[in-house]
Interface confidence: medium
């Protein structure tokens, strides 16, 4: 069952797939100048059995100046279901998806293929998220977002990544700030310190916000 | 004209591992982003609305963020919360909030 | 961004209480909703979508499709009259609806 949407966009990120689960197709696309061989493949498959898979088909470009063609129209994002993935190294790789049954790896390049891949993904699929340079991450989390099947409709889940920070600002590009876990089941309970009849819980257990105020003669 | 700080006191969570924010929420209305900080490292990031109005700062090794004014105005008259930006991002957990009136 | 909700929702006790908030690509975002009730602090009540924090009653359930978020209360109680905020984020920003009033009849 292919996804119907595309990963979420997360602003100042890009995502990719580790693998591919058996029944990914990609799209044959050629670079500017250049055009699918007229006998060629539409698409690559991953497919295989229990033990291995593999891509059919294979992706031949050549160039367009050899003959007199029509050009190709790209369809619209909204006409053409598109799966989007740049070639980014992911720092976070909690399995090696490439070892999985029923997984292909990353394609290899051929010849003349365009800088963008388009992938069509299959419910299943994980792909993994880190912001792209100069922006970090404001804390770890799971940074993945898979397709899932919910009721008959496919969506993509929504990874827990938020990219912030300019190239300028930033002192330490693409770092991420640890995020630790609250120590047990915290309690939302505060008190103001102004007026000071709030019961206070204060204990190793609970995450509290307080709040005071302090005032200085302005000079 | 006058200054004011006001400060927000975790406890309980590691303070310095959780971005800290400022929520203001004038009379009657609704809720405005302020800004954010890190306590870790002190790392601020300012709502365009309030950059340069306010200065949100954090001493990690007393768990708590403050925020700021050098020179009140009778706009600056509302409610500031602070907030935890919890696991997934949410705001889990404010505090009680602190009224600030400003008048002449 | 902006985020645009409904300045008041009026539903009858034990009825189902719809509550949206819209903006572009919310649906790829982030949406989360707290309830403020008068004179205390927001507090959370839907965390990504339609994940509900500890201690949150059943009936609150939230969805997210298109550019469109949505806060539904199935059984509203009166005790759920309160103001309703959605939040996303938008870089480092945080990003607030205007806050629906609702109201149980």
């Known amino acids: 069952e292919l996804c119907d949407d595309d990963p979420p966009e997360i602003p100042h990120a890009t995502f990719k797939a580790m693998a591919y689960k058996e029944g990914t197709m990609l799209n044959c696309e050629c670079k500017r100048g250049f055009r699918r061989i007229k006998s060629g493949s539409l698409y690559m498959l991953c497919t295989g059995n229990s033990s291995h898979s593999s891509w059919d088909n294979q992706c031949q470009c050549t160039s367009s100046a050899t003959r007199n063609t029509t050009k190709q129209v790209t369809p619209q994002p909204e006409e053409q279901k598109e799966r989007k993935t740049t070639e980014m190294q992911s720092p976070m790789q909690p399995v090696d998806q490439a070892s999985l049954p029923g997984h292909c790896r990353e394609p290899p390049p051929w010849e003349n293929e365009a800088t963008e891949r388009i992938y069509h993904f299959v419910v299943g699929q994980m792909v993994y998220y880190q912001c792209v340079q100069g922006y970090r991450a404001l804390h770890r989390g799971p940074a993945e977002s898979v397709c899932k099947m919910t009721h008959g409709k496919t969506r993509w889940t929504q990874p827990q990544l938020i990219c912030t920070g300019e190239m300028e600002t930033s002192q330490f590009p693409g770092e991420e700030k640890p995020q630790a876990s609250p120590e047990g089941r915290p309690e939302s309970e505060t008190s103001c310190l102004v007026t000071t009849t709030d019961f206070q819980i204060q204990t190793e257990m609970a995450a509290t916000m307080e709040t005071s105020i302090f005032t200085t003669e302005y000079q | 004209g006058e200054s004011l700080k006001i400060s927000c006191k975790g406890s309980?969570?590691?303070?310095?591992?959780?971005?800290i924010g400022w929520v203001r929420q004038m009379p009657g209305k609704g809720l405005e982003w302020m800004g954010l900080?890190?306590?870790?490292?002190?790392?601020?990031r300012y709502s365009p609305s309030f950059q340069g109005q306010v200065t949100i700062s954090a001493d990690k090794s007393i768990s708590t963020a403050y925020l700021q004014w050098s020179s009140l105005k009778a706009s600056d008259t509302a409610m500031y919360y602070c907030?935890?930006?919890?696991?997934?991002?949410?705001?889990?957990?404010w505090g009680q909030g602190t009224l600030v009136t400003v008048s002449s | 961004s902006v985020l645009t909700q409904p300045p008041s929702v009026s539903v009858s006790p034990g009825q189902t209480a719809s509550i949206t908030c819209s903006g572009h690509?919310?649906?790829?975002?982030?949406a989360y909703w707290y309830q403020q009730k008068p004179g205390q602090s927001p507090v959370l009540v839907i965390n990504?979508?339609?994940r509900r924090p500890s201690g949150i009653p059943e009936r609150f359930s939230g969805s997210n499709s298109g550019s469109t978020a949505t806060l539904t209360i199935s059984g509203t109680q009166a005790m759920d009259e309160a103001d309703y905020y959605c939040q996303t984020w938008d870089g480092s920003i945080v990003v607030f609806g205007g806050g629906t009033k609702l109201t149980v009849l």
């Open positions: 309980g969570y590691s303070f310095s591992t959780y971005w």
């Open positions: 690509k919310l649906g790829e975002r982030f």
């Open positions: 900080i890190y306590p870790g490292d002190s790392d601020t």
């Open positions: 907030a935890r930006v919890g696991d997934g991002y949410s705001l889990d957990y």
């Open positions: 990504q979508y339609i």
